[in-house]
Protein backbone atom coordinates (compact mmCIF):
# COMPACT_ATOMS: atom_id res chain seq x y z
CA UNK A 1 0.00 0.00 0.00
CA UNK A 2 1.30 3.33 -0.51
CA UNK A 3 2.60 5.25 2.25
CA UNK A 4 0.47 8.26 3.23
CA UNK A 5 2.42 11.78 3.24
CA UNK A 6 2.86 12.03 6.61
CA UNK A 7 5.99 9.19 6.42
CA UNK A 8 7.81 11.94 4.37
CA UNK A 9 8.11 13.97 7.63
CA UNK A 10 11.60 13.54 9.41
CA UNK A 11 9.55 13.24 13.23
CA UNK A 12 8.00 9.73 11.11
CA UNK A 13 11.27 8.21 10.95
CA UNK A 14 12.66 9.24 13.91
CA UNK A 15 10.11 8.45 16.25
CA UNK A 16 8.68 4.88 14.46
CA UNK A 17 10.07 2.82 16.70
CA UNK A 18 8.60 4.24 19.72
CA UNK A 19 5.20 5.37 18.33
CA UNK A 20 5.11 1.09 17.31
CA UNK A 21 6.62 0.26 20.62
CA UNK A 22 3.27 2.74 22.42
CA UNK A 23 0.96 1.21 19.66
CA UNK A 24 1.44 -2.93 20.77
CA UNK A 25 1.58 -1.72 24.43
CA UNK A 26 -1.91 -0.03 23.72
CA UNK A 27 -3.21 -3.24 22.08
CA UNK A 28 -1.80 -5.09 24.92
CA UNK A 29 -3.50 -3.29 27.23
CA UNK A 30 -6.69 -3.19 25.30
CA UNK A 31 -7.00 -7.56 24.74
CA UNK A 32 -5.79 -7.83 28.42
CA UNK A 33 -8.98 -5.73 29.47
CA UNK A 34 -10.98 -7.29 26.96
CA UNK A 35 -10.33 -10.62 28.44
CA UNK A 36 -10.81 -9.25 31.97
CA UNK A 37 -13.85 -8.19 30.91
CA UNK A 38 -14.86 -11.61 29.16
CA UNK A 39 -13.99 -13.49 32.72
CA UNK A 40 -16.67 -11.29 34.30
CA UNK A 41 -18.82 -12.30 31.82
CA UNK B 1 2.26 29.93 3.92
CA UNK B 2 2.51 27.89 6.91
CA UNK B 3 0.35 29.25 9.43
CA UNK B 4 0.33 27.98 13.16
CA UNK B 5 -1.61 30.71 15.40
CA UNK B 6 -1.64 29.96 18.79
CA UNK B 7 -4.75 30.73 21.35
CA UNK B 8 -4.08 33.51 23.68
CA UNK B 9 -2.33 33.83 27.31
CA UNK B 10 -4.17 32.55 30.56
CA UNK B 11 -3.76 33.17 33.96
CA UNK B 12 -4.25 30.06 36.31
CA UNK B 13 -4.24 29.09 39.86
CA UNK B 14 -2.26 26.50 41.16
CA UNK B 15 -3.76 23.03 40.96
CA UNK B 16 -5.98 24.10 37.83
CA UNK B 17 -5.66 22.85 34.22
CA UNK B 18 -5.02 24.76 30.89
CA UNK B 19 -5.46 24.04 27.41
CA UNK B 20 -3.73 25.73 24.54
CA UNK B 21 -4.66 25.52 20.92
CA UNK B 22 -2.62 25.59 17.67
CA UNK B 23 -4.54 25.85 14.73
CA UNK B 24 -2.85 25.19 11.40
CA UNK B 25 -3.21 27.00 7.81
CA UNK B 26 -1.59 27.03 4.71
CA UNK B 27 -0.88 23.40 4.35
CA UNK B 28 -2.71 19.68 4.68
CA UNK B 29 -2.99 19.24 8.34
CA UNK B 30 -2.77 15.26 8.87
CA UNK B 31 0.52 15.25 6.20
CA UNK B 32 3.31 16.29 9.29
CA UNK B 33 3.19 15.45 12.73
CA UNK B 34 2.24 18.73 15.45
CA UNK B 35 4.98 19.04 18.66
CA UNK B 36 4.67 20.99 21.65
CA UNK B 37 7.51 22.89 22.89
CA UNK B 38 7.70 25.16 26.29
CA UNK B 39 9.50 27.71 27.64
CA UNK B 40 9.88 29.02 30.95
CA UNK B 41 11.53 32.21 32.12
CA UNK B 42 15.57 31.63 32.59
CA UNK B 43 15.00 27.66 31.14
CA UNK B 44 15.46 25.97 28.25
CA UNK B 45 13.61 25.08 25.63
CA UNK B 46 11.83 22.09 26.34
CA UNK B 47 10.03 19.66 23.95
CA UNK B 48 7.23 18.26 26.08
CA UNK B 49 5.01 16.04 23.15
CA UNK B 50 4.07 15.25 19.55
CA UNK B 51 1.15 14.11 18.13
CA UNK B 52 0.19 12.61 14.53
CA UNK B 53 -3.13 14.33 13.52
CA UNK B 54 -3.22 11.32 10.95
CA UNK B 55 -3.51 8.67 12.58
CA UNK B 56 -3.68 10.14 16.58
CA UNK B 57 -0.55 8.85 17.68
CA UNK B 58 0.97 10.40 20.67
CA UNK B 59 4.37 10.74 22.15
CA UNK B 60 5.11 12.41 25.22
CA UNK B 61 8.22 13.38 26.76
CA UNK B 62 8.64 11.26 30.02
CA UNK B 63 8.85 14.47 32.08
CA UNK B 64 5.09 15.46 31.63
CA UNK B 65 3.58 12.08 30.81
CA UNK B 66 0.54 11.88 33.51
CA UNK B 67 0.05 15.56 33.23
CA UNK B 68 0.20 16.69 29.58
CA UNK B 69 -2.27 15.77 27.34
CA UNK B 70 -2.09 16.45 23.44
CA UNK B 71 -5.13 16.24 21.19
CA UNK B 72 -6.06 17.22 17.84
CA UNK B 73 -9.78 18.28 15.71
CA UNK B 74 -8.92 17.62 11.88
CA UNK B 75 -12.10 19.03 11.02
CA UNK B 76 -10.80 22.28 12.41
CA UNK B 77 -6.89 22.11 11.50
CA UNK B 78 -6.42 22.26 15.19
CA UNK B 79 -3.80 20.91 18.15
CA UNK B 80 -4.80 21.12 21.62
CA UNK B 81 -1.99 20.63 24.37
CA UNK B 82 -3.81 20.11 27.84
CA UNK B 83 -1.41 20.63 30.97
CA UNK B 84 -3.21 19.54 34.43
CA UNK B 85 -2.06 20.02 38.12
CA UNK B 86 -0.41 23.41 37.61
CA UNK B 87 2.33 24.30 39.88
CA UNK B 88 4.44 28.35 39.52
CA UNK B 89 7.13 26.24 37.60
CA UNK B 90 4.60 25.81 34.71
CA UNK B 91 4.62 29.32 34.13
CA UNK B 92 5.86 29.69 30.53
CA UNK B 93 5.18 30.46 27.03
CA UNK B 94 4.10 27.52 25.26
CA UNK B 95 4.42 26.95 21.62
CA UNK B 96 3.67 24.17 19.17
CA UNK B 97 5.67 23.67 15.96
CA UNK B 98 5.74 21.67 13.12
CA UNK B 99 8.81 19.76 11.31
CA UNK B 100 9.58 19.42 7.65
CA UNK B 101 11.16 16.39 6.06
CA UNK B 102 14.31 17.37 7.07
CA UNK B 103 14.38 19.37 10.52
CA UNK B 104 12.08 18.86 13.23
CA UNK B 105 10.63 22.44 14.60
CA UNK B 106 10.67 24.46 11.19
CA UNK B 107 7.78 26.44 11.62
CA UNK B 108 6.58 27.97 15.13
CA UNK B 109 3.48 29.45 16.44
CA UNK B 110 3.68 33.14 18.29
CA UNK B 111 3.61 31.25 21.82
CA UNK B 112 0.52 31.48 24.18
CA UNK B 113 2.00 32.60 27.17
CA UNK B 114 0.27 30.69 30.43
CA UNK B 115 1.15 31.98 33.79
CA UNK B 116 0.64 30.05 37.29
CA UNK B 117 0.03 32.47 40.13
CA UNK B 118 -2.32 32.27 43.40
CA UNK C 1 18.09 12.36 28.80
CA UNK C 2 21.16 14.03 26.35
CA UNK C 3 22.37 17.63 27.69
CA UNK C 4 23.42 19.94 25.41
CA UNK C 5 25.80 22.41 26.64
CA UNK C 6 26.45 25.50 25.11
CA UNK C 7 29.14 28.48 25.17
CA UNK C 8 29.68 31.47 25.59
CA UNK C 9 26.10 32.06 28.16
CA UNK C 10 26.68 35.81 26.33
CA UNK C 11 28.72 36.92 23.50
CA UNK C 12 29.35 40.65 22.42
CA UNK C 13 29.80 41.12 19.05
CA UNK C 14 31.19 43.97 17.03
CA UNK C 15 28.80 44.41 13.76
CA UNK C 16 30.50 43.52 10.88
CA UNK C 17 32.65 41.14 12.98
CA UNK C 18 32.67 37.03 12.86
CA UNK C 19 31.18 35.10 15.81
CA UNK C 20 31.26 31.84 17.13
CA UNK C 21 28.72 29.99 19.33
CA UNK C 22 30.16 25.93 20.64
CA UNK C 23 27.35 23.23 21.53
CA UNK C 24 28.73 20.15 23.14
CA UNK C 25 26.33 16.85 23.98
CA UNK C 26 26.94 14.35 26.68
CA UNK C 27 27.13 11.58 24.21
CA UNK C 28 27.50 11.02 20.84
CA UNK C 29 24.08 12.20 19.11
CA UNK C 30 25.06 10.14 15.50
CA UNK C 31 21.79 8.17 15.01
CA UNK C 32 21.42 4.66 14.62
CA UNK C 33 20.91 5.93 10.91
CA UNK C 34 24.46 7.90 10.54
CA UNK C 35 22.57 11.24 10.61
CA UNK C 36 23.34 13.57 12.86
CA UNK C 37 20.13 15.51 13.79
CA UNK C 38 22.04 18.59 15.19
CA UNK C 39 20.01 21.97 14.45
CA UNK C 40 20.42 25.63 15.08
CA UNK C 41 17.75 28.24 16.58
CA UNK C 42 17.88 31.85 16.43
CA UNK C 43 15.30 33.54 18.78
CA UNK C 44 15.17 37.41 18.59
CA UNK C 45 13.77 39.40 21.47
CA UNK C 46 9.99 38.92 21.58
CA UNK C 47 9.85 36.62 18.71
CA UNK C 48 9.41 32.80 18.13
CA UNK C 49 12.32 30.37 17.58
CA UNK C 50 13.74 30.05 13.93
CA UNK C 51 15.27 27.59 12.19
CA UNK C 52 18.44 28.33 10.64
CA UNK C 53 20.52 25.00 10.05
CA UNK C 54 19.70 21.26 10.13
CA UNK C 55 21.85 18.10 10.24
CA UNK C 56 25.03 19.84 11.45
CA UNK C 57 25.27 21.97 8.90
CA UNK C 58 22.60 22.63 6.21
CA UNK C 59 21.03 25.93 5.94
CA UNK C 60 17.10 26.50 6.08
CA UNK C 61 15.08 28.09 2.87
CA UNK C 62 15.88 31.80 3.65
CA UNK C 63 18.40 31.88 5.69
CA UNK C 64 21.48 33.95 4.89
CA UNK C 65 25.00 32.22 4.14
CA UNK C 66 26.56 34.19 6.80
CA UNK C 67 25.33 31.55 8.99
CA UNK C 68 26.93 28.27 8.82
CA UNK C 69 26.96 25.36 10.50
CA UNK C 70 29.93 22.24 11.86
CA UNK C 71 31.00 19.68 13.80
CA UNK C 72 30.52 16.05 14.46
CA UNK C 73 30.00 13.16 17.33
CA UNK C 74 29.57 15.62 20.39
CA UNK C 75 31.03 18.67 19.82
CA UNK C 76 29.67 21.46 17.26
CA UNK C 77 29.79 24.86 16.39
CA UNK C 78 27.65 27.99 14.85
CA UNK C 79 29.72 30.47 12.96
CA UNK C 80 28.08 34.08 11.44
CA UNK C 81 30.85 35.29 9.51
CA UNK C 82 29.67 38.96 9.87
CA UNK C 83 27.32 39.91 12.72
CA UNK C 84 24.75 42.13 11.84
CA UNK C 85 22.09 44.26 14.05
CA UNK C 86 18.82 41.75 12.90
CA UNK C 87 21.17 38.35 14.27
CA UNK C 88 20.94 39.64 18.08
CA UNK C 89 19.46 37.08 20.46
CA UNK C 90 19.57 33.79 21.80
CA UNK C 91 21.03 31.15 19.68
CA UNK C 92 19.74 27.58 20.97
CA UNK C 93 21.44 24.35 19.17
CA UNK C 94 19.19 21.04 19.56
CA UNK C 95 19.27 17.78 19.27
CA UNK C 96 16.88 15.01 17.60
CA UNK C 97 18.96 11.86 17.77
CA UNK C 98 17.63 10.73 20.94
CA UNK C 99 14.61 10.76 22.97
CA UNK C 100 13.77 13.24 24.26
CA UNK C 101 14.84 15.28 22.12
CA UNK C 102 16.46 18.52 24.21
CA UNK C 103 17.90 21.98 23.68
CA UNK C 104 20.90 23.78 24.74
CA UNK C 105 20.58 26.39 27.15
CA UNK C 106 21.28 29.07 24.61
CA UNK C 107 23.70 31.80 23.57
CA UNK C 108 23.01 35.45 23.99
CA UNK C 109 24.75 37.31 21.14
CA UNK C 110 24.35 41.02 21.90
CA UNK C 111 26.55 44.58 21.37
CA UNK C 112 29.73 44.74 23.03
Known amino acids: SEEPPISLDLTFHLLREVLEMARAEQLAQQAHSNRKLMEII | QVQLVQSGAEVKKPGASVKVSCKASGYTFTDYFMKWVRQAPGQRLEWMGV????????FYNQKFKGRVTITRDTSASTAYMELSSLRSEDTAVYYC???????????WGQGTLVTVSS | DVVMTQSPLSLPVTLGQPASISCRSGQSIVHSDANTYLEWYQQRPGQSPRLLIY???NRFSGVPDRFSGSGSGTDFTLKISRVEAEDLGVYYCFQGSHIPWTFGGGTKVEIK
Open chain 3, 55 to 57: KVS
Open chain 2, 97 to 107: ARGTDRALFAY
Open chain 2, 51 to 58: INPNQGDI
